[in-house]
């Protein structure tokens, strides 16, 4: 779940379609699975399989469901309260530096190194030097590693390249 959404990511709702349930906002906010009406008086349900909202919100539109790319498998479908969950196909992984695409895992380790970690949807194979046990310098850190280290690790302002 990450940033920079564009206008097409906001899924326009049909005007008061019969199947869209309405309820009243609570403290100006609508519950997950809903968005707020333009006049702020109603909460309108998202459309199953088309759009969603995950938290209490004052969104004018629900967010459009992600469609898994080729090279990805759908782990769970989009519901009104949760976006589609996509995962790289077997033999490929999504690295932190290019999260928009799945990349092929390496088939083996360089000479003088031994494999200590398998290819997963989140990481390439992990290689270490036979003697020193240190990781290969070209190793891409697994996404899981960045998640577990995220709490307070930024001791200095982090930067966004671009």
């Amino acid at each position: 779940e990450s940033a920079l959404i564009t206008q097409q990511d906001l899924a326009p709702q049909q005007r008061a379609a019969p199947q869209q349930k309405r309820s009243s906002p609570s403290e100006g906010l609508c519950p997950p699975g809903h968005h707020i009406s333009e006049d702020g008086r109603d909460c309108i349900s998202c459309k199953y399989g088309q759009d969603y909202s995950t938290h209490w919100n004052d969104l004018l539109f629900c967010l459009r469901c992600t469609r898994c790319d080729s090279g990805e498998v759908e782990l769970s479908p989009c519901t009104t309260t949760r976006n589609t969950v996509c995962q790289c196909e077997e033999g490929t992984f999504r690295e932190e530096d290019s999260p928009e695409m799945c990349r092929k895992c390496r088939t083996g380790c360089p000479r003088g190194m031994v494999k200590v970690g398998d290819c997963t949807p989140w990481s390439d194979i992990e290689c270490v030097h036979k003697e020193s046990g240190t990781k290969h310098s070209g190793e891409v850190p697994a996404v899981e590693e960045t998640v577990t280290s995220s709490p307070g690790t930024p001791a200095s302002p982090c930067s966004l390249s671009g």
């Epitope: 779940e1 990450s2 940033a3 920079l4 959404i5 564009t6 206008q7 990511d9 906001l10 968005h35 707020i36 995950t54 938290h55 919100n57 004052d58 969104l59 004018l60 539109f61 967010l63 992600t66 976006n83 932190e96 999260p99 928009e100 996404v143 960045t146 998640v147 995220s150 709490p151 982090c158 930067s159 966004l160 390249s161 671009g162």
Partner: nanobody
């Protein structure tokens, strides 16, 4: 290159208010969804609120609904979090976050690749 710097934290009594700011430098934030997370002492990261791109609306965690308000001033390249009716359980380091993937608002640590330094909020009498 964008750098994020939070400010506005401090010591406040229960029931009091604070306004946190997150100043971004190096690039406009107007086209980015941005979020606030917090980490209480000895606990994991918790999503607080997210500001969706282009004033499309905002997300709030159940725990802060009706008490906190997220906003932004694109002309000042700054994200805000107005915190009212503060409680002891709101004590935490508050982080401003942004990610680079063109998808949806950041509501989990997995999607938050870029963090500010954090600002400490202590609610105590």
């Amino acid at each position: 290159e964008v750098q994020l710097l939070e400010s506005g934290g401090g010591l406040v009594q229960p029931g009091g208010s604070l306004r946190l700011s997150c100043a971004a430098s190096g690039r406009s934030i107007s086209n980015y969804a941005m979020s606030w997370f917090r980490q209480a002492p000895g606990k994991g990261l918790e999503f607080v609120s997210a500001s969706v791109w282009n004033n499309g609306g905002n997300y709030y965690a159940d725990s802060v609904k009706g008490r906190f308000t997220i906003s932004r001033d694109n002309s000042k390249n700054t994200l805000y979090l107005q915190m009212n009716s503060l409680r002891a359980e709101d004590t935490a380091v508050y982080y401003c976050v942004v990610a680079r993937t063109p998808e949806t608002p950041i509501t989990s640590a997995r999607g938050a690749n870029y963090w500010g330094q954090g600002t400490l909020v202590t609610v105590s009498s």
